[in-house]
């Protein structure tokens, strides 16, 4: 069965900054990720960034950065402006659209004992779903 | 290079079922979806519907909605549309066109077939 | 479903002339916006996406601009092989919707 694997870290340089990775644990080949916070793609979550293989990554505020770093992982780079660092309590969801294995979404979120530089797990959060 | 090559010109009679092919080539089929497009004789284009490669999943234009259906064989990197129960103001030139596998980014249409003629008579 | 009006229906000008062809969507549709040309008897080719953004291969005497609801398409120097028809479409919500296609001719 594919996985999808978030983690959410903080950066340690600047409190302000976040780091979203996500990966796909499967044999399929990505056609295409969304990363979503808030919640799950079109249940209740808000857009940050779009990735297509060829076509290219499309963002929206606060992303600050969207990147395949393999053929199957994907980092996004957040820039809190706000005083109250709202990022640290937020879910953040990739979804993977993979042939032959379809969508698998997973959320995952800064552990609420985070220090600066350190990371939440690379596993999958029980919310895995297939459409 | 990137193309889609369509099946050849269709005369068909009022009721009866046409189906086109389109084979992709030159990239991977199963990144992006195809799209079709028809355009009557004289007239504008008027999206028909689409299908993401990846997962079979289809959108179909509401007016369209019961006599359409979109299929791809990723084997052969081929997609198909069938339309049923055919009129007299289908006649038209049928496009597949490459694009997103959402419609919702990225989605502009390159390349496009180069048109299979269907024509509807009695 | 978003309409898309695109005017006008068709225009004749002279070699080198600049040639401005407008769209208004019924609703916004941020950029997603693209321009085609399609010349007699072939099939449409992508000119420019995302309303601004030039395709590849694609000379850089046409452009595009707009956001929302209006968009605008400009030949700077319009060229013999220009002669052809011209159709934005919208991607912002499904249906999938064109404009009604603009007539290009040298006069």
């Known amino acids: 069965t594919p996985e999808v694997w978030v983690q959410v870290q903080m950066e340690a340089t600047e409190l302000s900054s976040f780091t979203v990775h996500c990966g796909f644990l499967g044999p399929g080949s990505i056609s295409l990720v969304t990363v979503s916070w808030g919640g799950p793609d079109g249940a209740g979550g808000t857009k940050l960034a779009v990735l297509h293989p060829e076509l290219g990554t499309r963002q929206w505020a606060p992303a600050r950065q969207a990147r395949w770093e393999t053929q199957s992982s994907i980092s996004l780079a957040l820039e809190d402006s706000g005083a109250s660092s709202p990022f640290a309590n937020t879910t953040f969801c990739c979804k993977f659209a993979s042939f032959p294995e379809g969508s698998w979404e997973s959320c995952g979120s800064l552990p609420p004992s985070s220090d600066p530089g350190l990371s939440a797990p690379p596993t999958p959060v029980p919310i895995l779903r297939a459409d | 290079q990137v193309q889609l090559v369509q099946s050849g010109a269709e005369v068909k009679k009022p009721g009866a079922s046409v189906k086109v092919s389109c084979k992709a080539s030159g990239y991977t089929f199963t990144h992006y979806g195809i799209y079709w497009v028809r355009q009557a004789p004289g007239q504008g284009l008027e999206w028909m519907g689409h299908?993401?490669?990846?997962?079979?999943?289809?959108d179909y234009a509401q007016k369209l909605q019961g006599r359409v259906t979109m299929t791809t064989d990723t084997s052969t990197s081929t997609a198909y549309m069938e339309l049923r129960s055919l009129r007299s103001d289908d006649t038209a030139v049928y496009y597949c066109a490459r694009g997103s596998p959402t419609y919702e980014h990225f989605n502009w249409f390159d390349p496009w077939g180069q048109g299979t003629l269907v024509t509807v008579s009695s | 479903d978003i309409q898309m009006t695109q005017s006008p229906s068709s225009l004749s000008a002279s070699v080198g002339d600049r040639v401005t062809i407008t769209c208004q969507a019924s609703d916004d549709i941020s950029d997603y916006l693209n321009w085609y040309q399609q010349k007699p008897g072939k099939a449409p080719k992508l000119l420019i996406y995302d309303a601004s953004s030039l395709h590849t291969g694609v000379p850089s005497r046409f452009s595009g601009s707009g956001s929302g609801t209006d968009f605008t398409f400009t030949i700077s120097s319009l060229q013999p092989e220009d002669i052809a028809t011209y159709y934005c479409q919208q991607y912002g919500n499904l249906p999938i919707t064109f404009g009604g296609g603009t007539k290009v001719e040298i006069k």
């Open positions: 299908i993401y490669a990846y997962s079979g999943d289809t």
